[in-house]
């Protein structure tokens, strides 16, 4: 049975050309995390593997800094990069769990950051 | 230039343990990640597991209770032990490199593949 | 464990004429696809990293597309050394798996 829970840190907006950060955290669960996949739609922006480090797709290189931690540095935000990204945690034994952030960039400087939330867990499935 | 180069017998009995090395030269072991790869006759390639530049190994959960990686950095070589082996392991045994911070998890140098038959 | 599904099974091609082979995911692995290219006797040499990237020194005759459960190799121009298998593999999750090969013969 999946008992964790992903808290990430929500609703988020940041100016264009700033950075953000996108941070995920796996909690109430004793799984051992083997890969952490951070995605936007259904393309790659990074995977951080247990065993092997950071691997920052090349569509991305230029502007995606690994960490800190688990979670993902996004630079020199475009109007574009407003979306939907995903934290795909795959664990031992449990399988796989989901966390959804949505970015916001905006041309002003009211930008700021949403109240962390917390998302039920689910198994994830494209 | 990079080469690797698999070696081991190219027959073993059933029940017996299945034992390949790996050398490889032009390059330190001390990076990147290392690959087992196996193709059985007439059958698609199968991932086997790899051995990190730390040591630290993965195996494919359906071989995993059989196999085991290690590696001999002063000698610049990992092998491949699978034990209990039955005809199913027959197949062509590949090790390959990868490099995880560039290219994920696409291997781009192969060995030329060394064939094992299973037979008594 | 992700299953790749490879079409066609083989594909005979006219010298200069151009090839697609499909790859499909059994589920979403966003952009983590190789492509190999195994020539008759010899092992398979990579292609195509994060599904559309050229590995150094591979003619730009081959291209690779494709993000979620749908990938596509394509050859604009086959060349009679271009014969052999090609696999599809993914590297979303562990294990990482292969699809089953499509035979490229040149007619």
């Known amino acids: 049975m999946m008992t964790g829970t992903i808290e990430t840190t929500g609703n988020i907006s940041a100016e264009k050309g700033g950075s953000i950060i996108l941070q995920c955290h796996l909690s109430s669960t004793t799984a051992q995390v083997t890969q952490v996949n951070w995605e936007q739609q259904d393309q790659l922006l990074a995977i951080c593997n247990a065993d092997l480090g950071w691997h920052i797709s090349p569509s991305f290189k230029d502007r995606v800094a690994p960490g800190p931690g688990l979670g993902l540095t996004l630079q020199s935000l475009t109007v574009n990069d407003t979306g939907e990204y995903f934290c795909i945690y795959h664990t031992y034994p449990d399988g796989t769990y989901t966390g959804r952030i949505f970015l916001e960039v905006l041309e002003s400087s009211v930008a700021e950051h949403g109240a962390r939330f917390q998302i039920p867990h689910h198994h994830h499935h494209h | 230039e990079v080469q690797l180069q698999e070696s081991g017998p190219g027959l073993v009995k059933p029940s017996e343990t299945l034992s390949l090395t790996c050398a490889v030269s032009?390059?330190?072991?001390?990076?990147?990640?290392w690959n087992w790869i196996r193709q059985p006759p007439g059958k698609k390639l199968e991932y086997i597991g790899y051995?990190?530049?730390?040591?630290?190994?993965y195996y494919n959960p359906s071989l995993k209770s059989r196999v085991t990686i290690s590696r001999d950095t002063s000698k610049n070589q990992f092998s491949l032990k699978l034990s209990s082996v039955t005809a199913a392991d027959t197949a062509v045994y590949y090790c390959?490199?990868?490099?995880?911070?560039?290219?994920?998890?696409?291997?781009?140098?192969w060995g030329q593949g060394t064939t094992v038959t299973v037979s008594s | 464990d992700i299953v790749m599904t490879q079409t066609p099974l083989s594909l005979s091609v006219t010298p200069g004429q151009p090839a697609s082979i499909s790859c499909r995911a059994s589920?979403?692995?966003?952009?983590?696809i190789a492509w190999y290219q195994q020539k008759p006797g010899q092992s398979p040499k990579l292609l195509i990293y994060?599904?559309?990237y050229r590995y150094t020194g591979v003619p730009d005759r081959f291209s690779g597309s494709g993000s979620g459960t749908d990938f596509t190799l394509k050859i604009s121009r086959v060349e009679a050394e271009d014969v052999g298998v090609y696999y599809c593999?993914?590297?979303?999750?562990?294990?990482?798996?292969f699809g089953g090969g499509t035979k490229v013969e040149i007619k």
């Open positions: 390959a490199r990868g490099d995880y911070s560039n290219y994920g998890g696409a291997m781009y140098d």
């Open positions: 032009g390059y330190s072991m001390t990076s990147d990640y």
């Open positions: 051995i990190s530049y730390s040591g630290r190994t």
């Open positions: 589920q979403g692995v966003s952009t983590t």
């Open positions: 994060s599904a559309s």
């Open positions: 593999q993914q590297y979303y999750s562990s294990p990482f798996t």
